[in-house]
Interface confidence: low
Amino acid sequence: VLPAKPENISCIFYYEENFTCTWSPEKEASYTWYKVKRTYSYGYKSDICSTDNSTRGNHASCSFLPPTITNPDNYTIQVEAQNADGIMKSDITYWNLDAIMKIEPPEIFSVKSVLGIKRMLQIKWIRPVLAPHSSTLKYTLRFRTINSAYWMEVNFTKEDIDRDETYNLTELQAFTEYVMTLRCAPAESMFWSGWSQEKVGTTEEEAPYGLDLWRVLKPAMVDGRRPVQLMWKKATGAPVLEKALGYNIWYFPENNTNLTETVNTTNQTHELYLGGKTYWVYVVSYNSLGESPVATLRIPALNEKTFQCIEAMQACLTQDQLVVEWQSSAPEVDTWMVEWFPDVDSEPSSFSWESVSQARNWTIQKDELKPLWCYNISVYPVLRDRVGQPYSTQAYVQEGIPSAGPVTQADSIGVKTVTITWKEIPKSKRNGFIKNYTIFYQAEDGKEFSKTVNSNILQYRLESLTRRTSYSLQVMASTNAGGTNGTKINFKTLSISHHHHHHHHHH
């Protein structure tokens, strides 16, 4: 059987290294060897490249080496496949070396900001040594912020033959680290070089970008003053590296700027003590280059009626996220503030907040919250400068069984009845929403009985017990993950009711 006709011939000129062609099929059923016939020097010369018989393998590739690599030039290539049964020739293919030239990558040696020019980086590189001296090179510059996986690209050409080249990359973010890599190719070529080694540069710092500002209103004190915990953070979209030297706060009662108070701090939180009126609060951050735009917050008067527009809220878990969704009766509200913090018996150690715009849902990655911890999540509607009534819910990203069972005691022991009372498990030990309690009780040497009650019940009267009998009992608290038993208690039913005993004696 004759070998298959070589097809899909593809050639590439590795500048000053070799001229290599490949074809298909790569494998033949019987042993096949190949000859690649080339004409070069614009058709004036020809030669042959043979695949190596000694390896006894089918090589669907062959390379022509210097000094017969001529450039510029047009080559023709024809591949002959030969086996014991005969020869099969490919079609003749035509190759312009300028169009298939591949060169080495350039080498970036500098990525710097230029003093006084904002949001720009100047990239300097060395043209590849192995590149035609006089040809125009086209370039692709790839860049991304250091913590992003998404590359952006810009394409340009350079005609100069200096080996040091420069490109100014503009419209970047201020004070941000960028990663750069560069590739090049002769202008007419279809083959790009590999990418250069990555280099990192940082744009110049500017005055801070802006702040997100929020507050926690605390109950008024005995003297009538209201503690207000202010908190702020870099606005979403601020440069990653942005650092503030400090923050200026000023505040005053509405319509009375004469009573303006000012505070300077390096913290990102500050407690104010305000009167009962409406107040306006302003915060700016500053660095050596200037101030950020002002962040403004209105603190409502103590007796102000706040609007309510959230009708319902649900928290649900996906595989790796907690999603909170809410329904609102006010279509005009499109900004919401979400607060979340662990529901612990002590003061919460970590309080977090985030603004949501043009959505009625909020998501957080599960691994940003601690499993087995209950989180309080509140959503506040924000309409211009007014903050509405929050709607709150609780959620666990993962429930476990309680770390301890309920502490239980037996009261009002009778002949056939007993009242069992148990304490709620402390928040820190619940590890999930307690959905029910199960009372397990058993007479000595008797069958075990159980009774399950709702989680809001902390007392239960057992009836139809046997008189003058020892019982053991424990209460199990259950979450969705399972239950944990409290300590076992023992009691003995009476032989005769106290009531009956006294009555008898009286007669």
Epitope: D367, K370, Q398
Partner: antibody
Framework: EVQLVQSGAEVVKPGASVKVSCTAS????????IHWVRQRPGAGLDWIGR????????KYAPKFQGRATLTADTSTNTAYMQLSSLRAGDIAVYYC????????????WGTGTLVTVSS | DIVMTQTPLSLSVSPGETASISCKAS??????VTWFRQKPGQSPKLLIY???NRYTGVPDRFSGSGSGTDFTLRISTVEADDTGVYYC?????????FGQGTKLEIK
């Protein structure tokens, strides 16, 4: 990339203390527990204790109670283990490990720090 | 403390065979058992968690089973790269404890 990089090897005198650091990258230690485990030469693994960096709460194995002190600095995303009154039996590689609660496992281990006690 | 006892302490298996390592807890640890492998000079690497769940990227030749007090790690079609010391560990109750380790050699 999520990783825990520990401080370099230490040679200390008997009776002295050593403090090993464990710096996290790719995640916030406030959202996990950091545990410490030691491995004596040619021997198995021994749990020392754990810290919750969000609030500083610690739990120790009884045999290390009083000698080991676990701390964390969330601003630098670093956990520390200090072991005092060192003796020859404390020669070991000390590892920190991240405990992934959602599925209950140590999914990331530190690079290990060799502590040698020698006069 | 809960004691985790591994058997055997060393094991020599030919490539392609199955290796089994047993781990016994001194009291019930439900399914709170994790298996690790440690190669010389390296940190332990997670293989199996919650007794039977394979960690991301671990080949399905590795499987874990058991609950209560008896647990087993099985490596089917053993390969040369499977050498190392295998540890079980319980995180059911503090202090968390490890088995003594089983050294797996490939013949």
């Amino acid at each position: 990339e999520v990783q825990l990089v520990q401080s370099g090897a230490e040679v200390v005198k008997p009776g002295a203390s050593v403090k090993v650091s464990c710096t996290a990258s790719g995640f916030n230690i406030k959202n996990t527990f950091i545990h410490w485990v030691r491995q004596r030469p040619g021997a198995g693994l021994d749990w020392i204790g754990r810290i919750d960096p969000a609030n500083g709460n610690t739990k120790y194995a009884p045999k290390f109670q009083g000698r080991a002190t676990l701390t964390a600095d969330t601003s630098t995303n670093t956990a520390y283990m200090q072991l005092s009154s060192l003796r020859a039996g404390d020669i070991a590689v000390y590892y920190c490990a991240r405990y992934y609660y959602v599925s209950s496992y140590f999914d990331v281990w530190g690079t290990g720090t060799l502590v040698t006690v020698s006069s | 403390d809960i004691v985790m006892t591994q058997t055997p302490l060393s094991l020599s298996v030919s490539p392609g065979e199955t290796a089994s390592i047993s781990c016994k807890a001194s009291q019930s640890v439900t399914n709170d058992v994790t298996w690790f492998r440690q190669k010389p000079g390296q940190s332990p690497k997670l293989l199996i968690y919650s007794a039977s769940n394979r960690y991301t990227g671990v080949p399905d030749r590795f499987s874990g089973s058991g609950s209560g007090t008896d647990f087993t790690l099985r490596i089917s079609t053993v390969e040369a790269d499977d050498t190392g010391v295998y540890y079980c560990q319980q995180d059911y109750s503090s202090p968390w404890t490890f088995g003594q380790g089983t050294k797996l050699e490939i013949k």
